[in-house]
Interface confidence: low
């Protein structure tokens, strides 16, 4: 339905508060280096303009597209050339090339200072002094660091952030009330950002068909009682929402997401019995709740899949008539029967089925050719099952920190060219799969573990894409979305790697390590471990363990010393010499 003024339409649909918040998110995700005050000024100008269009949709410029309006506004930033370099060239382009140009310059790893949390009293004072600015600052800081954060979901985070301060700044023990809530929001926010990044990568790098396949599988697992036509409708709508958000169309995205939540709740009887509680919540909570809702129970007495997809004489006829629809039905039927499989496994099975039909439907006797197709699934199912079993056993034996270290060594040997901070970040996140998923019963382990690993490996892929250094990473990241994890799992030690020259500076530590949190201290040690492996890729587990144990003892000793700095200087030299000897450097 065409509107005379798109900006007026969205302003009316979303309301002023959400409109302003979403425009701020959009601008911060595009111009990640701009100061907060500059963005607030731009947002206020856009909002005032939108209000004139609401009053009179025929007013000058009100008929322009949102990309044109927003792009024109971003291109008024005076320091664009010196702050962003070649991104300023985007402003010479016309829409929609200009918007695509801005999208291509989004930086997954912007050079921004780490967010340091002020004292609780300082935060509470700032919150009380100017609540609106305080919350806008939160949106701005998250959006600029996470340029693909799912905008309507960020509004939900901001609502929880506000609620935490409203409650805790009145509490007797403000810190005890507030800090755990902020920690939870930070961790959930990072997870939410990474999950959305995978959705955008899926759409942008592998196309809409890949995303739709993922959505069919996931929604069929979640809503196994819904019929195929219903799942297809939800997939189409969900694809539109994520295409918009990933494309920077945040107002349309938030509006369409609200419409989708409304539709789901109005039709929950034909979708899922688990939606009742979600649908009683306010909009932001409702959308979040639906996105996280547990799988509905599988219908009783589902017939065998083989009847329609192997035994039927019409398989090739049905496939030829509407390939994607038939494959979609296969994926739907398989996924609703297998909540115990990861989405990526289901997609591998569907791909195998598609490849088999492509080959067999051209054969002399198609039925004879594809009769054993389900037998080809067995090794595909067993591979992740065995991998998860082995890794959960290792996790239970080592605990999270040492399990992360095992993965650090494993991945540094596979792709030693990758930067140390990236290897540490990715391996730490890979290692979290243990505490996240190994506690689950068998039936929930694979969807938890393998789909989580897909999210983490996508982080590696997007960070590596910015500065590609390893052909092996590029190959695993670009060849197949669903086979990324098996591709990385299959990598052996990179025999072509020339070990990094030893640099004592890398292993020089100071007394500041003693005041770090346990997490920060772990990261320091894990950074040293990666560097060790880069110097000595053929080092054995035992050698590395010995050096790391010495290192832990060294830090503990010097942090207890009276003159810490002298201890770090003197003992550090001894440690470096001993480590070199132990590793034969």
């Amino acid at each position: 339905d065409a509107h005379k003024s798109e900006v007026a339409h969205r302003f009316k649909d979303l309301g002023e508060e959400n409109f302003k918040a979403l425009v701020l998110i959009a601008f911060a995700q595009y111009l990640q280096q701009c100061p907060f005050e500059d963005h607030v000024k731009l947002v206020n100008e856009v909002t005032e303009f939108a209000k004139t269009c609401v009053a009179d949709e025929s007013a000058e410029n009100c008929d322009k597209s949102l990309h044109t309006l927003f792009g024109d506004k971003l291109c008024t930033v005076a320091t664009l050339r010196e702050t962003y370099g070649e991104m300023a060239d985007c402003c010479a382009k016309q829409e929609p090339e200009r918007n695509e140009c801005f999208l291509q310059h989004k930086d997954d790893n912007p050079n921004l200072p780490r967010l340091v949390r002020p004292e609780v009293d300082v935060m509470c004072t700032a919150f009380h002094d100017n609540e609106e600015t305080f919350l806008k600052k939160y949106l701005y800081e998250i959006a600029r660091r996470h340029p693909y954060f799912y905008a309507p979901e960020l509004l939900f985070f901001a609502k929880r952030y506000k609620a935490a301060f409203t409650e805790c700044c009145q509490a007797a023990d403000k810190a005890a009330c507030l800090l755990p809530k902020l920690d939870e929001l930070r961790d959930e926010g990072k997870a939410s950002s990474a999950k959305q990044r995978l959705k955008c990568a899926s759409l942008q790098k592998f196309g809409e068909r890949a995303f739709k396949a993922w959505a069919v599988a996931r929604l069929s697992q979640r809503f196994p009682k819904a019929e195929f036509a219903e799942v297809s409708k939800l997939v189409t709508d969900l694809t539109k929402v994520h295409t918009e958000c990933c494309h920077g169309d945040l107002l349309e995205c938030a509006d369409d997401r609200a419409d989708l939540a409304k539709y789901i709740c109005e039709n929950q009887d034909s979708i899922s019995s688990k939606l009742k509680e979600c649908c009683e919540k306010p909009l932001l909570e409702k959308s979040h709740c639906i996105a996280e809702v547990e799988n509905d129970e599988m219908p009783a007495d589902l017939p065998s899949l083989a009847a329609d997809f192997v035994e039927s004489k019409d398989v090739c006829k049905n496939y030829a008539e509407a390939k994607d629809v038939f494959l979609g039905m296969f994926l739907y039927e398989y996924a609703r029967r297998h909540p115990d499989y990861s989405v990526v496994l289901l997609l591998r099975l569907a791909k195998t089925y598609e490849t088999t039909l492509e080959k067999c439907c051209a054969a002399a006797d198609p039925h004879e050719c594809y009769a054993k197709v389900f037998d080809e699934f067995k090794p595909l199912v067993e591979e992740p099952q065995n991998l998860i079993k082995q890794n959960c056993e290792l996790f239970e034996q080592l605990g999270e920190y040492k399990f992360q270290n095992a993965l650090l060594v494993r991945y540094t040997k596979k792709v030693p060219q990758v930067s140390t901070p990236t290897l540490v970040e990715v391996s730490r996140n890979l290692g979290k799969v243990g505490s996240k998923c190994c506690k689950h019963p068998e039936a929930k382990r694979m969807p938890c573990a393998e789909d989580y690993l897909s999210v983490v490996l996508n982080q590696l892929c997007v960070l590596h894409e910015k500065t590609p250094v390893s052909d092996r990473v590029t190959k695993c990241c670009t060849e197949s979305l669903v086979n990324r994890r098996p591709c990385f799992s299959a990598l052996e030690v990179d025999e072509t790697y020339v070990p990094k020259e030893f640099n004592a500076e890398t292993f020089t530590f100071h007394a500041d390590i003693c005041t770090l949190s346990e997490k920060e201290r772990q990261i320091k040690k894990q950074t040293a471990l990666v560097e060790l492996v880069k110097h000595k890729p053929k080092a054995t587990k035992e050698q590395l363990k010995a050096v790391m144990d010495d290192f832990a003892a060294f830090v503990e000793k010097c942090c207890k010393a009276d003159d810490k700095e002298t201890c770090f200087a003197e003992e550090g030299k001894k440690l470096v010499a001993a480590s070199q000897a132990a590793l034969g450097l």
Partner: nanobody, 123 residues
Framework: EVQLVESGGGVVQPGGSLRLSCAAS????????MGWFRQAPGKERERVVS????????YYADSVKGRFTISRDNSKNTVYLQMNSLRPEDTATYYC????????????????WGQGTLVTVSS
Amino acid sequence: EVQLVESGGGVVQPGGSLRLSCAASGLTFSSYAMGWFRQAPGKERERVVSISRGGGYTYYADSVKGRFTISRDNSKNTVYLQMNSLRPEDTATYYCAAARYWATGSEYEFDYWGQGTLVTVSS
């Protein structure tokens, strides 16, 4: 009313070149991904190439990679298909199609279709 009109088809010798054009009207051209599909006599319609609404992303079928190039001119509401090193197996009716959202997808994801233009590669 939305119209997609293909032109530029014809008879060409193996190894030769052709440039197909598709002029769109009745839609906001820059809001649509565009694609070319083809159908040889007695065969399924197959996806050849598609391009995103701003031209930033393209998809090519393996059979045409390195030989065919898709481009678009949003100011002229036109999408082009430059076909080089043509082979007899490229003989088909070529259809232009428009999709509201960028897809590398199948024909089901395209909303509007042209009538087609015939390309014959023969010596």
